[in-house]
């Protein structure tokens, strides 16, 4: 689709190769309270239920990230039985976090990508029989 | 659990109230290639399938974010029919993005929280009977 140029041509585009490598970040987070309507019970009500595990790292922002682990390999059917004709799989998302650059640290951070499992979904398996 | 203090006491903890409000960020992203094993077909194989919509904003980093929209209100059963005894619901995650602070922009960004739908899962509905 090509790069969309911001109004001010002196501002590099954030999707651009020329996006600055060192930038100043204001950490007064915008939208601090997103309409998060925590799907707090989806992990139990899902046919592919999951447990949430706390991943904590004081050298990272945010320091706490919750990761999903599917409870079963199969999916829970209408009778409450785990059916292996279907598969529970994690839905993963790449997120950005800030990582302290060094122990000497001042106010210097590095942007880091993390792949986290957000929840699970039930899929039809791909069955491969022996030739 | 309390705040875990980093080795160097002069470094504020990233989970702390005193975490610096203005920090320098190196945008040479760590883990640029996460083991993303893109679950590229889960959105079609799921019993709660979803479509992916491109959300583009040149004033944001990352400039492109993919958002999931559940295809059905119900879930797809073994016969390939949509069953409304179950519900497709979006799994949402709060992510961090960088927002250009102003059109005059130099290298100044603000951290912003966004709530994005990553995929969908099939849940048993909560049935509320009339009193």
């Amino acid at each position: 689709a090509g790069i969309v140029i911001p109004q001010n041509p002196e501002c590099p585009n954030t999707g651009d190769k020329n996006f600055p490598q060192n930038v100043k970040i204001n950490l007064n987070v915008l939208n601090r309270k997103t309409n998060s309507r925590r799907a707090s019970d989806y992990h139990n009500r899902s046919t592919s239920p999951w447990n949430l595990h706390r991943n904590e790292d004081p050298e990272r922002y945010p320091s706490v990230i919750w990761e999903a682990k599917c409870r079963h390999l199969g999916c829970v059917n209408a009778e409450g039985k785990v059916d292996f004709h279907m598969n529970s799989v994690p839905i993963q998302q790449e997120i950005l976090v800030l990582r302290r650059e060094s122990q000497n640290c001042p106010h210097s951070f590095q942007l880091e990508k993390m792949l986290v499992a957000v929840g699970c979904t039930c899929v039809t398996p791909i069955v491969r029989h022996m030739g | 659990a309390g705040i875990v203090i980093p080795q160097n006491p002069e470094c504020p903890n990233t989970g702390d109230k005193n975490f610096p409000q203005n920090v320098k960020i190196n945008l040479n992203v760590l883990n640029r290639k996460t083991n993303s094993r893109r679950a590229s077909d889960y959105h079609n194989r799921s019993t709660s399938p979803w479509n992916l919509h491109r959300n583009e904003d040149p004033e944001r980093y990352p400039s492109v974010i993919w958002e999931a929209k559940c295809r059905h209100l119900g879930c797809v059963n073994a016969e390939g029919k949509v069953d409304f005894h179950m519900n497709s619901v979006p799994i949402q995650q709060e992510i961090l993005v960088l927002r250009r602070e102003s059109q005059n922009c130099p290298h100044s960004f603000q951290l912003e929280k966004m709530l994005v739908a990553v995929g969908c899962t099939c849940v048993t509905p909560i049935v509320r009977h009339m009193g």
């Epitope: 409450g80 398996p125 | 194989r45």
Partner: antibody, heavy 120, light 112 residues
């Protein structure tokens, strides 16, 4: 340490039902599943059923109509009931813990087994 | 059901030799999540089975490093680099990707 111990009747008459209890220690049934596996004399292993940590179950479909599994988390016990026994149900019956630290889906600790003979 | 075919049925070895057991499944054991739930157990005479290798190649705690597992999809191998007297018994391969979970018929490792 992790332990599982099966207790059963030993001898069962044909067409009667079998009830076996697996008593566990060293782990919790709210965190781990428990499988039942049997082994006829001099033969291989046959998986029967599992009750997962959340109380859901998965049965071997070939035996599903004759099997029933349940548990009592507070008593640390898992129960297997099997109906309409025939002589070819004679076997050593084992309970085994489902190893789900890291989601490996293997049976990491087994009981010593309880011998069941179906005979009149 | 997934059929697990183990070879050989009997494996006579001399102590100190290398031993190799093969197992083939009738369908791929790769789960939709990308993992392969294939395992090896050892049952010594008069004892219950013990987990040796889980998820193809991971040694269970306390298992000596002379045991190694490999393979993918439908073909798997267990190798014992130097057989010791305590390794004798029946080795079973197993899968838990598909229900019902199934076992191979067993390979008896015995002294030549």
């Amino acid at each position: 340490q992790v332990q599982l111990k099966e207790s059963g009747p030993g001898l069962v008459a044909p067409s009667q039902s079998l009830s076996i209890t697996c008593t566990i220690s060293g782990f919790s049934l709210t965190s781990n599943g428990v499988h039942w596996v049997r082994q006829p004399p001099g033969k291989g292993l046959e998986w029967l059923v599992v009750i997962w940590s959340d109380g859901t179950t998965t049965y071997n479909s070939a035996l599903k109509s004759r099997l029933s599994i349940s548990k009592d988390n507070s008593k640390s016990q898992v129960f297997l009931k099997m109906n309409s026994l025939q002589t070819d149900d004679t076997a050593m019956y084992y309970c085994a813990r489902h190893y789900d630290r890291g989601y490996y889906y293997a049976m990491d600790y087994w009981g010593q087994g309880t011998s069941v003979t179906v005979s009149s | 059901d997934v059929v697990m075919t183990q070879t050989p049925l009997s494996l006579p070895v001399s102590l100190g030799d290398q031993a190799s057991i093969s197992c083939r499944s009738s369908q791929s054991l790769v789960h939709s999540n990308g993992n392969t739930y294939f395992h090896w157990y050892l049952q010594k005479p008069g004892q219950s089975p013990k987990l040796l290798i889980y998820k193809v190649s991971n040694r269970f705690s306390g298992v000596p490093d002379r045991f190694s597992g490999s393979g993918s999809g439908t073909d798997f191998t267990l190798k014992i680099s130097r057989v010791e007297a305590e390794d004798l018994g029946v080795y079973f391969c197993s899968q838990s990707t598909h229900a019902p979970f199934t076992f191979g018929s067993g390979t008896k490792l015995e002294i030549k």
